[in-house]
């Protein structure tokens, strides 16, 4: 990763944040859809 001068720590943190963001968006969309259908 970047010629080995970086640890992979920051990338792992950011990947986990991206997954959280994605899941929050998907769940938020589903919730809005459920409310709309009611």
């Amino acid at each position: 990763h970047s010629d080995g001068i970086f640890t992979d720590s920051y990338s792992r943190y950011r990947k986990q944040m991206a997954v959280k963001k994605y899941l929050a968006a998907v769940l938020g969309k589903r919730y809005k859809q459920r409310v709309k259908n009611k």
């Epitope: 990763h1 970047s2 010629d3 001068i5 970086f6 640890t7 720590s9 920051y10 990338s11 943190y13 950011r14 990947k15 986990q16 944040m17 991206a18 959280k20 963001k21 929050a24």
Partner: antibody, heavy 117, light 113 residues
């Protein structure tokens, strides 16, 4: 293998209150990957470090500190291995050394920004 | 907003002695361990020392060690050398969906006698 900063000049980029300035940060001696993040941190004279925000080299995703409030904008050019920080509506309180930091591990030498009339 | 409180703000140590710096976070650090430590000398950018609370960055002497998890973290400098005189900062990583992704502690100045 370092980050080279330009824009204000280590000797001092003088800007008037309300003015704007663009700082840049270029990777030197290594290639940045898509999962690399360019972060910006500032340090007012005699004070501590303050996180500004980060941008991903690949997708251009950004995260800003709440206090930034839209005044600063991050951008990047992965082909040029460069990240930029656009500073707008500057006030005296923005006078600081501005650092870029790759993955918050490797740091640029800093760019001094002085806001004064 | 999150707060990282570093104590003490200044500490004096004799050559060969030991220094302990504390960093307390509110809320808890992401995954309990995403916390880094930096050393900064006057006129220089910060230097990366420790990541994920206890892992030593490349080229950092083993005199430096980090510990802790959740909200309480410690940086210990053993066998203190004159070259260790600097200001030390902790950096917290947080859940970006609820607070700012990162925050620095206020810094601890280490004076070597």
């Amino acid at each position: 293998q370092q980050l080279e900063q330009s824009g204000g000049g280590a000797e001092g980029g003088l800007v008037k209150p309300g003015g704007s300035l663009k700082l840049s940060c270029k990777a030197s001696g290594f290639t940045i990957s898509r999962d690399y993040w360019i972060c910006w941190v500032r340090q007012a004279p005699g004070k501590g470090l303050e996180w500004i925000g980060c941008i991903s080299a690949g997708g251009g995703s950004t995260d800003y500190a709440n206090w930034v409030n839209g005044r600063f904008t991050l951008s990047r050019d992965i082909d040029q291995s460069t990240g930029c920080l656009q500073l707008n509506s500057l006030t005296d309180a923005d006078t600081a050394m501005y650092y870029c930091a790759g993955n918050l591990e490797i740091w640029g030498q800093g760019t001094l920004v002085t806001v004064s009339s | 907003a999150q707060v990282l409180t570093q104590t003490p703000s200044s500490v004096s140590a004799a050559v060969g002695g030991t220094v302990t710096i504390n960093c307390q976070s509110s809320p808890s650090i992401y995954s309990g361990a995403f916390l880094s430590w930096f050393q900064q000398k006057p006129g220089q950018p910060p230097k990366f020392l420790i990541y994920e609370a206890s892992k030593l960055a490349s080229g950092v002497p083993s005199r430096f060690s980090g510990s802790g998890s959740g909200t309480q973290f410690t940086l210990t400098i053993s066998d203190v050398q004159c070259d260790d005189a600097a200001t030390y900062y902790c950096l917290g990583f947080y859940d970006c969906s609820s607070v700012d992704c990162h925050a620095f502690g206020g810094g601890t100045e280490v004076v070597v006698k």
